[in-house]
């Protein structure tokens, strides 16, 4: 950056090089150039010469004042016009940053995805700070009182092998940057209560042309957890509202769920599961599309749902879905 240049003087910032966004700041430049009594001192921000709110303090020093500085990052340097020099002489440069102190981290959540071998902890960091902000995740055993700390920039994966202090822990998050430090509330966890079963996946759908046509959705999970509760939600792609069906599931075989749907309509399905009675659900599975036939029976398999597209749904947990090749309209 600009801070690596050889200086012929000094540049400094008040109140500091990293400061709260929206503050008034002063940047000072002091020349110390051999055989040069500067006629003029100039400031540049990101290579553009600044013209206004510059005050000459004395023969070697000038001040540039910014009101309500809102840029997250800027490279500043200053130059001098020396008598008998054709070009300006570089004095010094500095990178400056503005931002906010961190908010108190909240919504601290720790889960263990089955087979991952990790405990994944996440939190809501609050508003964007614009400056380098680090998080320390504290994990304290309630049985041994031993505490471990993990430094990260966002979420953290902690190997379950490293959690040797029994099953019960306190978890909290400390956020810190150059402008401040905040600490979350403590979350109490039991390792057995935070396991999320292996992802449930819808594999195919078929509509059986009975007296009243019915659609069967086939879905499965690789989980070894015995008691699993699941939800399947579905809707016509033109609708906003989801219908939800609940299931108590044993994944020793592929699940088959029956639905009585309107003919000649495209539907979208998703499934999610949790260990029965526990706290955390899986995220909803990928969107699965099935168009019910007018009269002819039809099978839709995951293998044929190859066109990736954005769902356009306003549900936060929906990921990119797949669409049957015969229907490419947006989801309403």
């Amino acid at each position: 950056g600009i801070t690596n240049i050889n200086c012929s003087g000094h540049i400094w910032v008040e109140p500091a090089t990293i400061f709260k966004m929206g503050m008034n700041i002063s940047i000072y430049c002091q020349a110390a150039i051999k055989n040069c009594q500067p006629r003029k001192l100039h400031f540049y921000k990101n290579g553009i010469k600044e013209r206004f709110q510059i005050t000459r303090i004395n023969k070697t020093t000038a001040r540039l004042w910014y009101k309500n500085f809102l840029e997250p990052h800027a490279s500043m340097y200053c130059t001098a016009e020396c008598p008998k020099h054709f070009q300006e002489t570089l004095i010094c440069g500095k990178d400056i940053s503005s931002g906010y102190p961190p908010d108190i981290p909240d919504e601290v959540t720790c889960v263990i995805y089955e087979y991952s071998g990790n405990m994944t902890c996440t939190w809501n960091a609050g508003k964007l700070t614009y400056i380098d902000t680090k998080y320390v995740v504290h994990v304290k055993s309630l049985e041994t009182e031993e505490e471990q700390q993990y430094l990260t920039s966002s979420y953290i994966n902690i190997s379950t092998d490293s959690l040797q202090g029994g099953k019960k822990y306190l978890v909290w998050v400390q956020a810190a940057n150059a402008l401040g430090m905040e600490e979350s509330k403590q979350l109490q966890i039991h390792l057995d209560d935070i396991v999320i079963p292996s992802a449930a996946v819808i594999s195919r759908a078929e509509t059986i042309n009975a007296t009243v046509p019915k659609t069967i959705i086939y879905w499965d999970s690789q989980t070894t957890i015995e008691k699993v509760s699941c939800e399947m939600r579905y809707k016509a792609t033109t609708n906003q509202t989801w219908n939800v069906k609940e299931f108590d599931t044993n994944f020793t075989y592929v699940q088959q769920s029956e639905f009585y749907l309107e003919p000649n309509i495209k539907y979208v399905f998703q499934v999610r599961c949790q260990e029965t009675g526990k706290r955390y659900w899986q995220p909803w599975s990928s969107l699965f599309f099935h168009k019910t036939p007018e009269t002819v029976p039809q099978v839709t398999s995951k293998a044929f749902q190859h066109d990736t597209w954005n769902s356009g749904l306003t549900v936060a947990s929906i990921s990119t879905g797949h669409l049957t090749s015969d229907n490419r309209g947006d989801i309403g």
Epitope: R51, I54, T55, F86, Q87
Partner: antibody, heavy 117, light 107 residues
Framework: EVQLVESGGGLVQPGRSLKLSCVAS????????MTWIRQAPGKGLECVAS????????YYPDSVKGRFTISRDNAKSTLYLQMNSLRSEDTATYYC??????????WGQGVMVTVSS | DIQMTQSPASLSASLGETVTIECLAS??????LAWYQQKPGKSPQLLIY???SLNDGVPSRFSGSGSGTQYSLKINSLQSEDVSIYFC?????????FGGGTKLELK
């Protein structure tokens, strides 16, 4: 020796366009803010357009905003002023000048623009 | 925009006299004031910057002073070549603004 040489002035009818040029030499053009300043006959000085050293930002007073456009070609050390929809009140001598935090330290000789039918 | 009020609008003085021209800014401009001389039929020339710094090649009989909102240009021992219009200009705030000018004539 510092020189700023303007060209492109003349007599023009109201509503028509004119483009002024200013060729700079003797200083580091690409480090300099540049400005067009005009002076109506017997009147004071008015800045009509300024441009940053990189050309990334421009400034105009309300009297010319939307009609005048300042631009620069640093490779050619040349400053331009495109004047559209000219009015009789735009009649003036137009000076090209280098602008810095000490003021307008270099000026061209000026070029006369007369807007009249 | 910052208003620059120059006074007097015109003045007559004799050779060898000392002349003072005033400039008042509508806000504190922190000594970011320049003075220009415009001889008849010529371009303006920078005389003084930062309220009191003499530009290269300007005779020492010219001097500037002032701070805050009040500034002045003084010409000691007036010479015939000093007959000109003098303008003040602030360049602390955007846009830069000029005073209305002071026309200096010989008595």
């Amino acid at each position: 020796e510092v020189q700023l040489v303007e060209s492109g002035g003349g007599l023009v009818q109201p509503g028509r366009s004119l483009k002024l040029s200013c060729v700079a030499s003797g200083f580091t053009f690409n480090n300099s803010w540049m400005t067009w300043i005009r002076q109506a006959p017997g009147k004071g000085l008015e800045c009509v357009a300024s441009i940053t050293n990189t050309g990334g930002s421009t400034y105009y007073p309300d009297s010319v905003k939307g009609r005048f456009t300042i631009s620069r070609d640093n490779a050619k050390s040349t400053l331009y002023l495109q004047m559209n929809s000219l009015r009789s009140e735009d009649t003036a001598t137009y000076y090209c000048s280098r602008e810095d935090n000490s003021g307008y330290d270099y000026w061209g000789q000026g070029v006369m623009v007369t807007v009249s039918s | 925009d910052i208003q620059m009020t120059q006074s007097p609008a015109s003045l007559s003085a004799s050779l060898g006299e000392t002349v003072t021209i005033e400039c008042l800014a509508s806000e504190d401009i922190y000594s970011n004031l320049a003075w220009y001389q415009q001889k008849p039929g010529k371009s303006p020339q920078l005389l003084i910057y930062y309220a009191n710094s003499l530009n290269d090649g300007v005779p020492s009989r010219f001097s500037g002073s002032g701070s805050g909102t009040q500034y002045s240009l003084k010409i000691n021992s007036l010479q015939s070549e000093d007959v000109s219009i003098y303008f003040c200009q602030q360049n602390y705030y955007s846009p830069p603004t000029f005073g209305g000018g002071t026309k200096l004539e010989l008595k």
